[in-house]
Structures are given as C-alpha cells and as structure tokens.
C-alpha cells in the first residue's frame, strides 16, 4: 500500500485518517528533502493530481482542503518540485478512509440448526459503515452468570458443546469501529426453544388424472423433532403474490400435499418448517418448479356434464393451485 513507501517528509490528515463521511478534511504535506527548497508541492489522490484548494503554508508545507469528502477510501501522496530535478520527488503517502460509526445492532437472533452442533447468532448491523467494524458477541449464562465473548466481523457460530452454563442465556452484541461503539439490547434465549428442524425438501410431484386433476407434492425432512409446523407457499411464475398453506406435520413418513392447479401454467413451490409453538422458521426451501399439463379441450355439452374434459395427465415435477389439509369432513 501507499503507507509502505520511504518518506522524505510526512503527510497527515485532520481531523484523522479515518473520519466521518461527509466531513470537511485537511491534508497536510511537509517536505524534508535534502538539498531541496520545494518550488511547488503537489497532492495526488488515487494517482490523479489535485489542482484546486491547495494552500502553501510555508516553504516546506502545504495544505489540501476537501469539502464534504464522500469517498470510502483514497490513497493520498504528495510530491515536491525541487530545483535542478527533472521530475517531482515523492515526499510521503497515506491511505485515508471515511465512513460511519456503527448503528446499534438490533434483531439479534440465535438459532440452533438441527444436527449442526452450533448456535448461530445473527443481527441487523444497520447502515453500511464503509470502514472496518468488529462485533463482540456476549453470551452470559443466567444460571452460572459466566460470560463468554466472541469476536467476529459478521455472524457467529458458537459450538453448543461450549455452552456449559445450562439452557438459559443472555446474548447481546457490541459493534465498534474507529468512529464509535454501540451495544444491542439483550436477547434472552432458552436452548430448547431455538432449534430449527432439519431442512424440509420438496422431492417430487405427480398429477392424478381425475375429474379435477390433483397435483400431489411429496416433501420430507430428516428431523427427529416430533411436533413440527410447516408452511408451503406457491404461485404461478408469472405472478407476484404467493398462496401460503399451513400444516401440522409428522415426519415419520414422506408428506403428501394436494393442490388444485390451473392448467398449462408453470408454478413454483417452497416449503419451510418450525418446531411447533417455537419462534424461528427454517429459511424457505429452494424453488421447485412444475408446469401443469393442458386440460382445456373444446368441450361439447355432453362432455361438459361428464368427464371427458381432461386429456391424459402425466407430470413428473410439481405444480400449484389449492393445497388441501388433511382434515376430513366425512360423517360416519
């Protein structure tokens, strides 16, 4: 970087080399070159010579002034024009940065993905700081009062084996950079309440040729959690709004969900689950696409009243329309 060069003088920044974005700043350059009384002092930003807002302070020093500096990073260096030298002589260089102090971290969330062996904590860091910002995650046992701290630049994975202080913890996050420090509210967690079941996956679909063709979605999870609530959402790929259906699920067998779907339309499905009654959901599963078969022949009056509407239906992916839960309405 620019800071590794051999200097013949020095360069400094007021108020600091890291400063709040949008500030007015001054960059000073002082030459200390043997046998050189500089005729002129020049400033360069990212290799480009600056032509304005330069003031000569004395024989060896000049100032460059910037109003409302908005660049996150810049490399500055200055040079001197020395008598009897055909080219400018480098004085010194410095990297400068502008940014913001961190916002208060909020939406602190800690979850344990089933089988991961880790507690994953994330938070909303707020607006971009543009400068190096570190986060310290504090985990304090409510039973032993022991506190552990973890340094990170984004989220943190904490091995559940290291959580030896029982089941209840306080978690909070401190954010710090050169311009300031902020601390989140404390999140109280119980390890049993933050488990997210093993990912639910849509595996296949089939369409049954019936008076009203039904598409059956097959989906599963490797979870060992007994009581799981799931949502499946679906829509035509040309539409923006999703239909969402809810299920109480027992994953001791592959799930089958029925949809009534409009013909000749490409649909997309996703599923997600949570331990019933708990707070956190899985992320939505990867998109599963299916185009429904055509079932729109020109009908006669006879065909309309009977069941010759539907052309043969064979589907080997997935589709959507109406998902029906398994609550039966039969009498007897």
């Amino acid at each position: 970087g620019i800071t590794n060069i051999n200097c013949s003088g020095h360069i400094w920044v007021e108020p600091a080399t890291i400063f709040k974005m949008g500030m007015n700043i001054s960059i000073y350059c002082q030459a200390a070159i043997k046998n050189c009384q500089p005729r002129k002092l020049h400033f360069y930003k990212n290799g480009i010579k600056e032509r304005f807002q330069i003031t000569r302070i004395n024989k060896t020093t000049a100032r460059l002034w910037y109003k409302n500096f908005l660049e996150p990073h810049a490399s500055m260096y200055c040079t001197a024009e020395c008598p009897k030298h055909f080219q400018e002589t480098l004085i010194c260089g410095k990297d400068i940065s502008s940014g913001y102090p961190p916002d208060i971290p909020d939406e602190v969330t800690c979850v344990i993905y089933e089988y991961s062996g880790n507690m994953t904590c994330t938070w909303n860091a707020g607006k971009l700081t543009y400068i190096d910002t570190k986060y310290v995650v504090h985990v304090k046992s409510l039973e032993t009062e022991e506190e552990q701290q973890y340094l990170t630049s984004s989220y943190i994975n904490i091995s559940t084996d290291s959580l030896q202080g029982g089941k209840k913890y306080l978690v909070w996050v401190q954010a710090a950079n050169a311009l300031g420090m902020e601390e989140s509210k404390q999140l109280q967690i119980h390890l049993d309440d933050i488990v997210i079941p093993s990912a639910a996956v849509i595996s296949r679909a089939e369409t049954i040729n019936a008076t009203v063709p039904k598409t059956i979605i097959y989906w599963d999870s490797q979870t060992t959690i007994e009581k799981v609530s799931c949502e499946m959402r679906y829509k035509a790929t040309t539409n923006q709004t999703w239909n969402v259906k809810e299920f109480d699920t027992n994953f001791t067998y592959v799930q089958q969900s029925e949809f009534y779907l409009e013909p000749n339309i490409k649909y997309v499905f996703q599923v997600r689950c949570q331990e019933t009654g708990k707070r956190y959901w899985q992320p939505w599963s990867s998109l599963f696409f299916h185009k429904t078969p055509e079932t729109v022949p020109q009908v006669t009056s006879k065909a309309f009243q009977h069941d010759t509407w539907n052309s043969g239906l064979t589907v080997a992916s997935i589709s959507t329309g109406h998902l029906t839960s398994d609550n039966r309405g039969d009498i007897g």
């Epitope: 019936a210 008076t211 009203v212 063709p213 829509k235 035509a236 040309t238 539409n239 923006q240 709004t241 239909n243 029925e258 009534y260 779907l261 409009e262 013909p263 339309i265 079932t295 729109v296 309309f304 069941d307 509407w309 329309g321 109406h322 029906t324 839960s325 398994d326 609550n327 039966r328 309405g329 039969d330």
Partner: antibody
C-alpha cells in the same frame, strides 16, 4: 346430468350457527370434482366460502376459517355448510356449486338466509 | 386477496350493438372466468379459461385478456344477453369475484 338442491332455514338469530345442506343427484360426490359453498350478499357481491373435495379434504376462505366447517355424508350424497357465530353481516343468498379447475360449472338454486333477532 | 374490478358497473346497449366489458385484477392472474346471472336465478358459468365458451353459450360471446386485464365481448347484442356478468379468478386463494357489470337493453 348433475343437479344440486339446497335446504336449510331462512332465518337465523345472531350468535347462533347456520347449517345448510346440498343434495347432489346425477353424480357421486366421492367420484370427483370439489363441492363448494358460495354466498351472494344483498349488494350482489359474490364470495367463495370453501369446499370439500371428493376425498373429503377441505379448503376454506381465510376470512371465514375460524367459523366455517364443510362436511359430507357420502351415503346420502350430500354435503353441508356450518357457519358459527353468525351476525347480520352473514345475511346473504347461499349457493352450493360443483367446482372444476378454477370455476364452478353447476350451481344450486340458492337459499336466502336472513340473520336477525 | 386479489381484488377484481369490473367496469363499467352498469351499461346499456341496443340490439345488434357490440358490447365490451372489462375486468381488472389487482395482481396478475393466469386465467379469467365469467358468469352470467339473471335476476332471481343462480349464476351460470359463461366463459372459462379466459376464452372458452361454456356449453350453450352463443358464439357471439368471446373472452380475451392476460395478466391483470381481461374482457368479455358480445359481437352483436341480443335481448337475452341482458344480465349481470361477473368475473372470477382462481390463481390465488381465496378465489374472488368482481362486483359485476349489469348489462341492460337500451
């Protein structure tokens, strides 16, 4: 040819439950299609309420989900609407209808229901 | 819920006149379905899958459209066409209807 006939009271008191029956002839409700209840309010607005399909599974309009139940008696080829905790807002003409993929191809004659004390 | 907006709410047409009514969905739908209802009668399926005429519907009727915007057209108005026409979508639950266009004979 499928035909749908409806029966049920014309007057129900507020907070009581409404029960309607749709009797289907010319087609077995277990053979296919889905069997719907819809209603039309005095201002002519139509609202789909829910269905029971040929397997006995239900789907309901979320606006009614906590109050509605659609069941069937396969031996009589009938399906039923029960709407709990009715208010004057539920005054409407209620229709049963056979559903296909997206639309309703056969409708019952309708039952006018008034909710009043 | 997808809101279906029909226009005009009421219209009148002379015998032989071409009639067009429209239905707009608040978000894109796959198909549109139309029903005809005469006073003191149940609605009847009239057009399904946007452009297919239900059995018994005269060929002077047609349906068209895509996305958010659909229409029902009568090429030449006849007296028996005076009725209220409702549009309906099945794309998103709950299935919803428009408020209707009442077509009167001038």
């Amino acid at each position: 040819e499928v035909q749908l006939q409806q029966s049920g009271p014309g007057l129900v008191k507020p907070s009581q439950s409404l029960s309607l029956t749709c009797s289907v002839t010319g087609y077995s409700i277990t053979s296919g299609y889905f069997w719907n209840w819809l209603r039309q309010f005095p201002g002519s607005k139509l609202e789909w309420m829910g269905f029971i399909d040929n397997d006995g599974s239900n789907d309901y309009n979320p606006s009614l989900k906590n109050r509605i139940s659609i069941t069937r008696d396969t031996s009589k080829n009938q399906f039923f609407l029960r709407l709990n905790s009715v208010t004057t807002e539920d005054t409407a003409t209620y229709y049963c209808a056979r559903g296909r993929l997206g639309f309703f191809d056969s409708w019952g004659p309708g039952t006018t229901l008034t909710v009043s004390s | 819920d997808i809101v279906m907006t029909q226009s005009p709410a009421i219209m009148s047409a002379s015998l032989g006149e071409k009639v067009t009514m429209s239905c707009r969905a608040s978000s894109s739908v796959n198909y549109m379905y139309w029903y005809q209802q005469k006073s003191d009668a149940s609605p009847k399926l009239w057009i399904y899958y946007t452009s297919n005429l239900a059995p018994g519907v005269p060929a002077r009727f047609s349906g068209s459209g895509s996305g958010n915007s659909y229409s029902l057209t009568i090429s030449s108005m006849e007296g028996e066409d005076a009725a209220t026409y409702y549009c309906q979508q099945f794309t998103n639950s709950p299935w919803t209807f428009g408020a209707g266009t009442k077509l009167e004979l001038k």
